[in-house]
């Protein structure tokens, strides 16, 4: 059974992940057309099911494409000082949270998502898990 300290650690990690994802989303939401129009042509794959920490495997698999988008669409109004570091930090948190005991084959939904929908989906996931922990 998880101890209160491990639960607290998980909660902190989720909150950190949540803040990182929200920071990216806020930056993108500040983009003006036609830049936003261009960014929305990037497609992301969504999990069929995301209710447990192990489902973070699906986020991990899409981090490379996310990094690519953020690098390509760097902006003077929203400049992530080091996209590589940010994605690397997210990756470290995701790996710790999902654990490595079980290697899950991610099942993706048939529909793809824009970067905005993708980030919102994983933000909702973090919020949902945090609420069950608190």
């Amino acid at each position: 059974a998880p101890t209160s300290s491990s639960t607290k650690k998980t909660q902190l990690q989720l909150e950190h992940l949540l803040l990182d994802l929200q920071m990216i989303l806020n930056g993108i939401n500040n983009y003006k057309n036609p830049k936003l129009t261009r960014m929305l042509t990037f497609k992301f794959y969504m999990p069929k099911k995301a209710t447990e920490l192990r489902h973070l495997q699906c986020l991990e698999e899409e981090l490379k494409p996310l990094e690519e988008v953020l690098n390509l669409a760097q902006s003077k109004s929203f400049h992530l000082r080091d996209t590589k570091d940010l994605i690397s930090n997210i990756n470290v948190i995701v790996l710790e949270l999902k654990g490595s005991e079980t290697t899950l084959m991610c099942e993706y939904a048939d529909e793809t998502a824009t970067i905005v929908e993708f980030l919102n989906r994983w933000i909702t996931f973090c919020q949902s898990i945090i609420s069950t922990l608190t």
């Epitope: 003006k32 036609p34 830049k35 129009t37 261009r38 960014m39 042509t41 990037f42 497609k43 794959y45 494409p65 690519e68 988008v69 390509l72 669409a73 760097q74 902006s75 003077k76 109004s77 048939d110 529909e111 793809t112």
Partner: antibody, heavy 121, light 113 residues
Amino acid sequence: EVQLVQSGAEVKKPGESLKISCKGSGYGFTNYWIGWVRQMPGKGLEWMGTIYPGDSDTRYSPSFQGQVTFSADKSISTAYLQWSSLKASDTAMYYCARQGRSYYYFGMDVWGQGTTVTVSS
Amino acid sequence: DIVMTQTPLSLPVTPGEPASISCRSSQSLLDSDEGNTFLDWYLQKPGQPPQLLIYTLSYRASGVPDRFSGSGSGTDFTLKISRVEAEDVGVYYCMQRIEFPLTFGGGTKVEIK
């Protein structure tokens, strides 16, 4: 090796239907937009539009909207260009080309060999 | 639609000599916010499909010799070949991808004198 292989040359009569194909290999076919480009005899290149095989999202250039249909079968890594009723003016070479994860942010870095379509009565 | 205009229509060249092709767009291809210029150059050799030479104004595509270079700003662009080789003959096209629909220039035919 990353490549796009197109179906063979076609000779058709006006009013007939046609579907040509473009099969990708050596990369994650579903993750890249596939553009279609027309080249009429002795003329330049025209971008017809693009399809994302991962979800079959299509974007048509206004000049080609309603004239052609793009489709894709991701299970066999193949994109298609089709006409329901060919006209003599459809006579051209048609190329498919890989357009990256976004057709705005990437050039067309891999091209099919082209499919010649001849429409004549 | 953005109109892309190339000059000259035809360019006779001497092997070993430099050559340059111009391309002009009817509106700016520069996104000043992100600093990208959404212009590519393609070469179509006789009897072959086009191939990507230069993307995003000045980046050489994989396997493209360094004698090819792209430059320009806003609406005026140039493709330069520092020393033309016999294998460089064909039709060169510029293409914009800042705005839908993507559009090509009419092409410049490069041939050996």
